[in-house]
């Protein structure tokens, strides 16, 4: 059985040229994480596997940055980065779990951070 | 240049354990990942397992663990591929491959390795 | 395991014929995959990656593209020495696995 939920950053908004930090966190379950893998719409950006570290896509390797953590930080935002981002932790032995963050992208300097939020 | 240059063919006998080699040059050991990569005679490639040598950390192909380990020399740059209770359907040629850095891409391979399980 | 099916198995083809190979994931594996190129008796060789990028020195008539659980291989314009075996290969989640492999063979 699946407890464990994850947090994440939720909604959140950044500066065209800026740079943004995604993180997800999993919590309530002692399942064991052995990689996440953060998507965007229909690709790869990166993966941190436990054993092996990190693999960052070719198409973001210049805009993408390990870390913190299993977190990710996206640099040199543009108006394209707007979307959806998806962390999706693999553990053993509960299997799956998919964290959602929207990140808006703006023209100006009205960017302001969302509020956290939990999916389970 | 990235060269991987592996130990030369074995013959072993059902039961026993095989040892290959695969020594880097040419790079930053410890920057890379090592895959190792099975062919059986006139069959597909076959993933056995993947070493990163700077954290010694690995990951198995379910149907070898236990039989298989990685390790990896980072005084020597050599990585090794060490298969226990041989059988006659691990015959295969074994290849060694290297990735560099954040990247899970293989691109340098090394020339292979015949082990012939055989009594 | 994630599973790597390739279509077809073997192909017949003549220099110059556009030729399509497809592998289907078992589940979701992103824009995690790869194409292999290899010749008997030789070692594969890295073709596509991620997987519309060409590596280093290969030649524009091959092309990939896919993403989520269906992927191609392009060949534009069949070359003499292209005809060899061809695999895709999954890194998106381990264990990685490879396809069973696409023999392209001269017609």
């Known amino acids: 059985m699946m407890t464990g939920t994850i947090e994440t950053t939720g909604n959140i908004s950044a500066e065209k040229g800026g740079s943004i930090i995604l993180q997800c966190h999993l919590s309530s379950t002692t399942a064991q994480v052995t990689q996440v893998n953060w998507e965007q719409q229909d690709q790869l950006l990166a993966i941190c596997n436990a054993d092996l570290g990190w693999h960052i896509s070719p198409s973001f390797k210049d805009r993408v940055a390990p870390g913190p953590g299993l977190g990710l930080t996206l640099q040199s935002l543009t108006v394209n980065d707007t979307g959806e981002y998806f962390c999706i932790y693999h553990t053993y032995p509960d299997g799956t779990y998919t964290g959602r963050i929207f990140l808006e992208v703006l023209e100006s300097s009205v960017a302001e951070h969302g509020a956290r939020f939990q999916i389970p | 240049q990235v060269q991987l240059v592996q130990s030369g063919a074995e013959v072993k006998k059902p039961g026993a354990s095989v040892k290959v080699s695969c020594k880097a040059s040419?790079?930053?050991?410890?920057?890379?990942?090592i895959e190792w990569i099975r062919q059986a005679p006139g069959q597909g490639l076959e993933w056995m397992g993947v070493?990163?040598?700077?954290?010694?950390?690995?990951n198995y192909a379910q149907k070898l663990q236990g039989r298989v380990t990685l390790t990896a020399d980072k005084s020597t740059n050599t990585a090794y591929m060490e298969l226990r209770s041989l059988r006659s359907d691990d015959t295969a040629v074994y290849f060694c491959?290297?990735?560099?850095?954040?990247?899970?891409?293989?691109?340098?391979w090394g020339q292979g390795t015949l082990v012939t399980v055989s009594s | 395991d994630i599973q790597m099916t390739q279509s077809p198995s073997s192909l017949s083809a003549s220099v110059g014929d556009r030729v399509t190979i497809t592998c289907r994931a078992s589940?979701?594996?992103?824009?995690?995959v790869v194409w292999y190129q290899q010749k008997p008796g030789k070692a594969p060789k890295l073709l596509i990656y991620?997987?519309?990028y060409r590596y280093t020195g290969v030649p524009s008539r091959f092309s990939g593209s896919g993403s989520g659980t269906d992927f191609t291989l392009t060949i534009s314009s069949l070359q003499p020495e292209d005809f060899a075996t061809y695999y895709c290969?999954?890194?998106?989640?381990?264990?990685?696995?490879f396809g069973q492999g696409t023999k392209l063979e001269i017609k």
């Open positions: 491959a290297g990735s560099y850095g954040s990247s899970y891409t293989f691109d340098y």
């Open positions: 040419g790079y930053a050991f410890t920057n890379y990942l």
């Open positions: 070493i990163n040598p700077g954290s010694g950390g690995t």
């Open positions: 589940q979701h594996v992103s824009t995690a």
């Open positions: 991620s997987p519309s």
């Open positions: 290969h999954q890194h998106y989640s381990t264990p990685w696995t």
